[in-house]
């Protein structure tokens, strides 16, 4: 006569997180008497999941009535697969004793489990950089299984090459991360822009998720400044115009400075907001000739975005404006700085 | 699908006799084969289970005098150095009781040892 | 070896009783319910009732329960019907495989 064989007929079975596995397996004999177990894994560390004899395993069920005449159908459907979960199975039949002793196992059922990665996260730089510069956004998925992962990086919709990526841990694990970086070059009409990180895996069913991240959070764009002086008013004042243009973020101080002193100091707000992005500002500052009997050194000194100050400087010559006559004189540029330096 | 014993007679104490279980409508192949005797007017006694092999096993009082054996489709009890106290009908029944207990049984051979 | 005490060793009731029978183990039976029933009637073999203590085998009425577990079991007859009158067996299983021992015993009649 043959001896008792144990047969676990799936070499593998894969199971979607949140489902229930079904783990096969039939003796070919009721002799001798003894309990059939499921362990997870082998060896003396093996984790029991499920004794016919005994104990209480809430999540096991077994699939044919164990109690039933002739049964030797010992397969068993676990419940509420998690990642944690995936191993290999193994069969085992037991022989009734004291205690009782292992007679023969099944071949075991490596037990996979399709585990959904979680929502891209896509983080940019801590600090902001400007046109030409080179940032880097991170994206990370974790908590995914099995190990194969697809992660492209996209700008306006173009996917971007300049991209390092890896699947964490190298080895066999319940589930798996993904971390990647991608390098952006900054142009000045980026404000707009936006970086998405895509993710697809067999579990989506071809709908990828997706991770963005908004240039604005990462740019600056620094202001032009330019300087004008208006033609002279009828009660010797002289309206001089400092335009501040296309800059990105909103955060910006202006000062006015006569002849070095403190004359006015502005907060930009609620500014309306350009098609790029960018903002535009002019502050007007009226100078009464009159009173000065020297030329007039005005600057206009802008702080954005916590950056050094920009300055425009530029003298309104007294001499050049008779008390009983208007001008049209434009000013004249002391400091032009025309960039902010990084 | 039933179990019939034959074998059984007088045999003279110190005697052997080899009681058959033969089966018909199933296979014993997959299952244990035990015995179990009944002396006239007492209650019932488990004697041993045949399996396969190695997995052949007696209680205590009949290890040594009583072995057994099986095909697929009959069991074989061999008694030997019989005596007095032997005298019982000897039923064979499928099954190696817990999970798997004695049914069908066999309708039972008497087996009377005397001089 | 492990020993079955049933009890009463007979009992006299009648047609539609409720009808209980005790079996008490010298130990704890294998996983706690190596435990069944047999019926059996003069001149015939025993039939099974019931195995791993509580299960009704097939084809048994449901009339038939047994419980208990570890070393205390009983069969219970709900009504007695007049093909219940038989004897009645609990056999119990030690762990070892070749431990296994019949009760003594319990003859119903009729009253």
């Known amino acids: 006569e043959e001896e008792l064989q144990v047969i676990q007929p799936e070499k593998s079975v894969s199971v979607a997180a949140g489902d229930s596995a079904t783990l096969n397996c039939t003796v070919s004999s009721l002799i001798p008497v003894g309990p059939i177990q499921w362990f997870r894994g082998a060896g003396p560390g093996r984790e029991l999941i499920y004794n016919l004899k005994e104990g209480h395993f809430p999540r096991v069920t077994p699939v044919s009535d164990p109690t039933k005449r002739n049964n030797m159908d010992f397969s068993i459907r676990i419940s509420n697969i998690t990642p944690a979960d995936a191993g290999t199975y193994y069969c085992v039949k037991f022989r009734k004793g004291s205690p009782d002793v292992e007679l023969k196992s099944g071949a075991g059922t490596e037990l996979s489990v399709r585990a959904k990665p979680s929502a891209p996260v896509v983080s940019g730089p801590a600090v902001r950089a400007t046109a030409e510069h080179t940032v880097s956004f991170t994206c990370e998925s974790h908590g995914f299984s099995p190990r194969d992962i697809t992660l492209k990086w996209f700008k306006n919709g173009n996917e971007l090459s300049d991209v390092q990526t890896n699947v964490d841990p190298a080895g066999k694990s319940v589930s798996y991360s993904i971390r990647s970086t991608a390098r952006v070059v900054l142009t000045r009409r980026d404000v707009h822009s936006q970086v998405i990180c895509e993710v697809a895996h067999v579990t989506l069913q071809g709908d990828p998720l997706r991770g963005t991240a908004n240039l604005s959070e990462a740019i600056r764009v620094p202001p032009f400044l330019e300087v004008t002086q208006q033609s002279m008013r009828a009660d010797n004042q002289v309206n001089v115009t400092c335009q501040v243009t296309k800059f990105y973020p909103q955060r910006l101080q202006l000062t006015w400075l006569e002849n070095g002193n403190v004359s006015r100091t502005e907060m930009a707000s609620a500014l309306p907001e350009n098609k790029d992005g960018t903002y535009n500002w002019t502050s007007w500052l009226l100078v009464n000739v009159s009173a000065h009997r020297d030329d007039v050194k005005l600057t206009c000194q802008v702080e954005h975005d916590g950056q050094p100050a920009v300055n425009k400087s530029f003298s309104v010559k007294v001499s050049a404006h008779p008390k009983e006559q208007g001008s049209n004189t434009a000013a004249e540029n002391t400091g032009t700085n025309e960039r902010n330096i990084y | 699908r039933q179990l019939v014993e034959s074998g059984g007679g007088l045999v003279q104490p110190g005697g052997s006799l080899r009681l058959s279980c033969t089966a018909s409508g199933f296979s014993l192949s997959s299952h244990g084969i035990s015995w179990v005797r009944q002396a006239p007017g007492k209650g019932l006694e488990y004697i041993g289970t045949i399996g396969t092999g190695v997995i052949t096993y007696f209680a205590s009082w009949a290890k040594g005098r009583f072995t057994g054996s099986k095909t697929s489709s009959t069991a074989y009890m061999e008694l030997s150095s019989l005596r007095s106290e032997d005298t019982a009908v000897y039923f064979c029944?499928?099954?190696?009781?817990?999970?798997?207990?004695?049914?069908?049984w066999g309708q039972g051979t008497l087996v009377t040892v005397s001089s | 070896d492990i020993v079955m005490t049933q009890s009463p060793s007979s009992l006299s009731a009648s047609v539609g009783d409720r009808v209980t029978i005790t079996c008490q183990a010298s130990q704890s039976v294998y996983g706690n319910n190596d435990l069944a029933w047999y019926q059996q009637k003069p001149g015939q073999a025993p039939k099974l009732l019931i195995y791993?203590?509580?299960t009704l085998a097939t084809g048994v009425p449901s009339r038939f329960s047994g419980s208990g577990s570890g070393t205390d079991f009983t069969l219970t007859i709900s009504s007695l019907q007049p093909e219940d009158f038989a004897t009645y067996y609990c056999?119990?299983?030690?762990?070892?495989?070749?431990?296994?021992?019949f009760g003594q015993g319990t003859k119903v009649e009729i009253k």
């Open positions: 029944a499928r099954g190696s009781a817990w999970n798997d207990p004695f049914d069908p």
């Open positions: 056999l119990g299983g030690g762990d070892d495989e070749a431990d296994n021992t």
């Open positions: 791993l203590a509580s």
